[in-house]
């Protein structure tokens, strides 16, 4: 790795291309400049994503996979770099771009929202759950009346087209339901969703969006919530939700409502049992909800509250504070 003393001239990479390899996924490829004289030095490359969202990183290899939305187009640059004597030598940039797909912006869907949910699976003898996906959207304000939309998702290497749509009064698809998917609920890959469309009157602009699973995964409420009063102790127990996450991966909130004085107690915990000291002469309704803890995944959504459980009696005796 000997460097000559004279000034090193770095040349930009050649044959820089951007290829769409999947839904919301591109492959950037380039080649070292064949005229680069210093072949025995450790050349690196700096990749700069210009649009739709700025980013830059360094790599030693001559290709790079990017997960990105594409409905706004995509633009990137790459240059040759060399670290030498605590300074950075760099070539000029080589650039390439993908143009935004055709269609008026007002024809694409708006307010695309998706949620995943874990449900029981009757077909699997080892993993008793499956992950469903539900997405909804609004018709574009400038979309012709005959517009029809079609939704696809990609998770990892799997891309699937929606087979079950809900329609508006004009017969246009406005929601999609996948009862089972290839989504790993414990995975860290982005979920990519694309909604494209067709019309006899104009080009419908596609719309794609990336979702982080932890942000859209609708956790199920805890199961089998029970509550009983023994003297002044209200004992509450429950089981973990239907979920691919194991028992140690949940945080819980318990809500105890005193029906007589309206007092509300909310406690957060990591175990699946809770004991509260209470006024044994009141009636209480108890609910529990769950969320995947940050030990197992980035913070996400709380489940709905479980159905209320009613305990205690409704006697009109003098109030005692909690």
């Amino acid at each position: 790795d000997l460097l000559p003393d004279d000034k090193i001239s770095l040349l930009p990479p050649v044959n820089f291309t951007i290829k769409v390899t999947g839904l919301a996924q591109v492959l950037l490829r380039w080649e070292p400049n064949p005229d680069q004289e210093q072949r025995n030095v450790n050349l690196e490359y700096q990749v700069k994503i210009n649009a739709p969202k700025e980013d830059d990183y360094e790599t030693r290899i001559t290709e790079s996979k990017c997960v990105t939305i594409l409905h706004k187009g995509f633009s990137a640059s790459v240059r040759t770099i060399l670290q030498k004597d605590h300074s950075l030598l760099a070539s000029s940039w080589a650039s390439a771009e993908l143009h935004a797909p055709p269609g008026s912006p007002g024809t694409s869907v708006v307010n695309l929202t998706c949620t995943t949910n874990t449900t029981a699976d009757n077909y699997s003898y080892l993993r008793p759950y499956q992950v469903s996906l539900h997405c909804t959207w609004l018709v574009g304000t400038d979309a012709p009346e005959d517009t029809q939309y079609f939704l696809y998702y990609r998770y990892g290497s799997w891309t699937e087209e929606c087979q079950e749509y809900s329609k508006d009064s004009m017969g246009r698809n406005i929601a999609c339901w996948f009862p089972r998917t290839f989504i790993h609920s414990r995975g860290r890959d982005w979920l990519a969703v694309l909604v494209n469309g067709s019309s006899k009157h104009s080009a419908i602009k596609p719309f794609d969006q990336l979702f982080a699973l932890h942000a859209i995964d609708q956790i199920n409420p805890p199961l089998n919530v029970t509550a009983e009063i023994k003297g002044t102790r209200l004992s509450i127990q429950w089981e973990k939700p239907v979920s691919a996450f194991p028992i140690h991966c949940f945080d819980y909130e318990v809500k105890i409502h005193n029906a007589r004085n309206g007092y509300l107690q909310i406690e957060k915990m990591m175990t699946n049992a809770f004991i509260s000291i209470i006024d044994d002469l009141s009636k209480y309704d108890v609910q529990v909800r769950a969320a995947v803890s940050s030990m197992c995944r980035e913070a996400g959504l709380w489940s709905e509250w479980s159905q209320p459980i009613y305990v205690g009696k409704d006697e009109h005796k003098p109030l005692r504070q909690w």
């Epitope: 077909y123 699997s124 080892l126 759950y129 990892g156 087209e161 790993h184 414990r186």
Partner: antibody, heavy 121, light 113 residues
Framework: QVQLQESGGGLVQPGGSLRLSCAAS????????MSWVRQAPGKGLEWVSA????????NYADSVKGRFTISRDNAKNTLYLQMNSLRAEDTAVYYC??????????????WGQGTMVTVSS | QSVLTQPPSVSAAPGQRVTISCSGS?????????VHWYQQLPGTAPKLLIY???NRPSGVPDRFSGSKSGTSASLAITGLQAEDEADYYC????????????FGGGTKLTVLR
């Protein structure tokens, strides 16, 4: 119980074609994603291809992409692998297996007994 | 060259405990992806032995157990028996590869007579 029975293997010349079949029984075939996994003589396991339950979405290993096509006929409970432009390195026992994902990394819970494909001149 | 690295062979006497390692990287096991293990007895098709790191399908003896830490996974077999002599494969998911499904190269377990 689940039964998978491969057929269609044999000797073929380089550049030739072969179509493997896998007959499934003992489970609701149309509810499951399915896969092909191969094993060259004396070597390890290599995942080849997979197809979703409805047959509309497929996946391939880089080593076979553009040459092999996976398909299924849910009415006949049968999985297929059409192999074109065969090479010597495709010589292997080909196993049909279910491709169980549900909520995590796919695993292969049930396997056929395999069918031998030999590519040689 | 497999993405997941296993020792080519291990051996132990009957009754002993043996472990088989499966070493990966940040793009597979190190990202928290599940690891599965298969047993392939001589002349037969592979059989799922452990799924989701440490779960056994029904019928698999509790002498077999799986574990995972960092970028590696391990299969442990206690009270080794002659019928455990087989090839063992780990399998996971690699986000950097097309298709994503990856196997280890396999480990031949020999039970010493």
């Amino acid at each position: 119980q689940v039964q998978l029975q491969e057929s269609g293997g044999g000797l073929v010349q380089p550049g030739g074609s072969l179509r493997l079949s896998c007959a499934a029984s003992g489970f609701t075939f149309s509810n499951y994603a399915m896969s092909w996994v191969r094993q060259a003589p004396g070597k390890g396991l290599e995942w080849v291809s997979a197809i979703n339950s409805g047959g509309k979405s497929t996946n391939y290993a880089d080593s076979v992409k553009g040459r092999f096509t996976i398909s299924r006929d849910n009415a006949k409970n049968t999985l297929y692998l059409q192999m074109n432009s065969l090479r010597a390195e495709d010589t292997a026992v080909y196993y049909c297996a279910d491709y169980a994902t549900n909520y995590g990394v796919p695993y292969f819970g049930s396997w056929g007994q395999g069918t031998m494909v030999t590519v040689s001149s | 060259q497999s993405v997941l690295t296993q020792p080519p062979s291990v051996s132990a006497a009957p009754g002993q405990r043996v472990t088989i390692s499966c070493s990966g990287s940040r793009s597979n096991i190190g990202s928290g992806y599940d690891v599965h293990w298969y047993q392939q007895l001589p002349g037969t098709a592979p059989k799922l032995l452990i799924y989701d790191d440490n779960n056994r399908p029904s019928g698999v003896p509790d002498r077999f157990s799986g574990s995972k830490s960092g970028t590696s996974a391990s299969l442990a077999i206690t009270g080794l028996q002659a019928e455990d002599e087989a090839d063992y494969y780990c399998q996971s998911y690699d986000s950097s590869l097309s298709g994503h499904v990856v196997f280890g190269g396999g480990t031949k377990l020999t039970v010493l007579r």
